[in-house]
């Protein structure tokens, strides 16, 4: 089971109307450029076999991947939203840095790896899709971690 006390984010992180709005605006703008609507990155398959107490740890992995492999490389796009949203998500990632799981997390890594593989396989359009799902990432992170 996770060390629950470290796999938590305060509700106040998600009660900031301005940055919430900017995150959703960024997602909306990117989703308009996403022409692959058949694939969803953040959905049932990502959470398959993951218990309630493990969800935040899983979302931490997804957040870190999204920051490092998607948002940082695409940081010059979708301005002015990107320059505001990226530091906000990076702060959340930093607050989850001590969130770990004791024991086997193979099932979680497997699920996250499938998401990573999908993004990589789609190339730049995979990165655009991931940005277009930042609203889902925001909400899933909130629901899993508060």
């Amino acid at each position: 089971a996770p060390i629950s006390s470290h796999c938590r984010l305060d509700k106040s992180n998600f009660q900031q109307p301005y940055i919430t709005n900017r995150t959703f605006m960024l997602a909306k703008e990117a989703s308009l450029a996403d022409n692959n609507t058949d694939v969803r990155l953040i959905g049932e398959k990502l959470f398959h076999g993951v218990s309630m107490s493990e969800r935040c740890y899983l979302m931490k992995q997804v957040l870190n991947f999204t920051l490092e492999e998607v948002l940082f490389p695409q940081s010059d796009r979708f301005q002015p939203y990107m320059q505001e949203v990226v530091p906000f998500l990076a702060r959340l990632s930093n607050r989850l840095s001590t969130c770990h799981i004791e024991g086997d997390d193979l099932h979680i890594q497997r699920n996250v790896q499938k998401l990573k593989d999908t993004v990589k396989k789609l190339g730049e359009s995979g990165e655009i899709k991931a940005i277009g799902e930042l609203d889902l990432l925001f909400m899933s992170l909130r629901n899993a971690c508060i």
Partner: antibody
Framework: EVQLVESGGGLVQPGGSLRLSCAVS????????MIWVRQAPGKGLEWIGI???????YYASWAKGRFTISRDSSKNTVYLQMNSLRAEDTAVYYC?????????????WGQGTLVTVSS | AVVLTQSPSSLSASVGDRVTITCQAS??????LAWYQQKPGKAPKLLIY???TLASGVPSRFSGSGSGTDFTLTISSLQPEDFATYYC??????????????FGGGTKVEIK
């Protein structure tokens, strides 16, 4: 094909006990949480409780103490044990699969089993 | 605990009509709202989640909108098979788990 079939309902006297079963097929209980919901005659839906993938259980505040959810993964069956039953517990009881997609959604549902508490 | 208030509690409409049902939450639930359809003597069926995402196999005449406290379910052109009761359902996180899932009181859509 995913299927959920409830059984065990019937007539029970006030103060009595009943155990409902929800037999699932087409998926594993080690991959999905399961919920129980009830519906009194002519009324709306009321959440009772949930059993998570790891066996943890959570209950609505009104259900704590009288209602217990358990499962037998080898039989692919979830149970709802109901004790100290009252007339107001008369309802159709449903089990449903909890699909977490970033938010909890309940899909599909069983056909329901009717519990009548009366003397 | 979050309270979901649906309105109207019942309505009469004809085939082809545009029907709108609202669901108001007593506190901010973001987009953590789902809609279910229930026909008499049957189990509820998932229609919409994330407030606006159509569940698999659900006809496109159904749509959902809203966030925060105010949500809407719209049926663009009512079909005979749509006469049923509709429930909204919220998932609330971060509070006590004993009030995580809440249903609205339901809206019965009847034939005019």
């Amino acid at each position: 094909e995913v299927q959920l079939v409830e059984s065990g309902g019937g007539l029970v006297q006030p103060g009595g006990s009943l155990r409902l079963s929800c037999a699932v097929s087409g998926f594993s209980l080690s991959s999905y949480a399961m919920i129980w919901v009830r519906q009194a005659p002519g009324k709306g839906l009321e959440w009772i409780g949930i059993i998570d993938i790891d066996g943890s259980t959570y209950y609505a505040s009104w259900a704590k103490g009288r209602f217990t959810i358990s499962r037998d993964s080898s039989k692919n069956t979830v149970y709802l044990q109901m004790n100290s039953l009252r007339a107001e517990d008369t309802a159709v009881y449903y089990c449903a699969r909890d699909r977490f997609v970033g938010v909890d959604i309940f899909d599909p549902w069983g056909q329901g089993t009717l519990v009548t508490v009366s003397s | 605990a979050v309270v979901l208030t649906q309105s109207p509690s019942s309505l009469s409409a004809s085939v082809g009509d545009r029907v709108t049902i609202t669901c108001q939450a007593s506190e901010d639930i973001y987009t953590n709202l789902a809609w279910y359809q229930q026909k008499p003597g049957k189990a509820p069926k998932l229609l919409i989640y994330w407030a606006s995402t159509l569940a698999s196999g659900v006809p496109s005449r159904f749509s959902g909108s809203g966030s925060g406290t105010d949500f809407t379910l719209t049926i663009s052109s009512l079909q005979p098979e749509d006469f049923a009761t509709y429930y909204c359902q919220a998932s609330v996180y971060g509070n006590s788990a004993d009030s995580r899932y809440t249903f609205g009181g339901g809206t019965k859509v009847e034939i005019k």
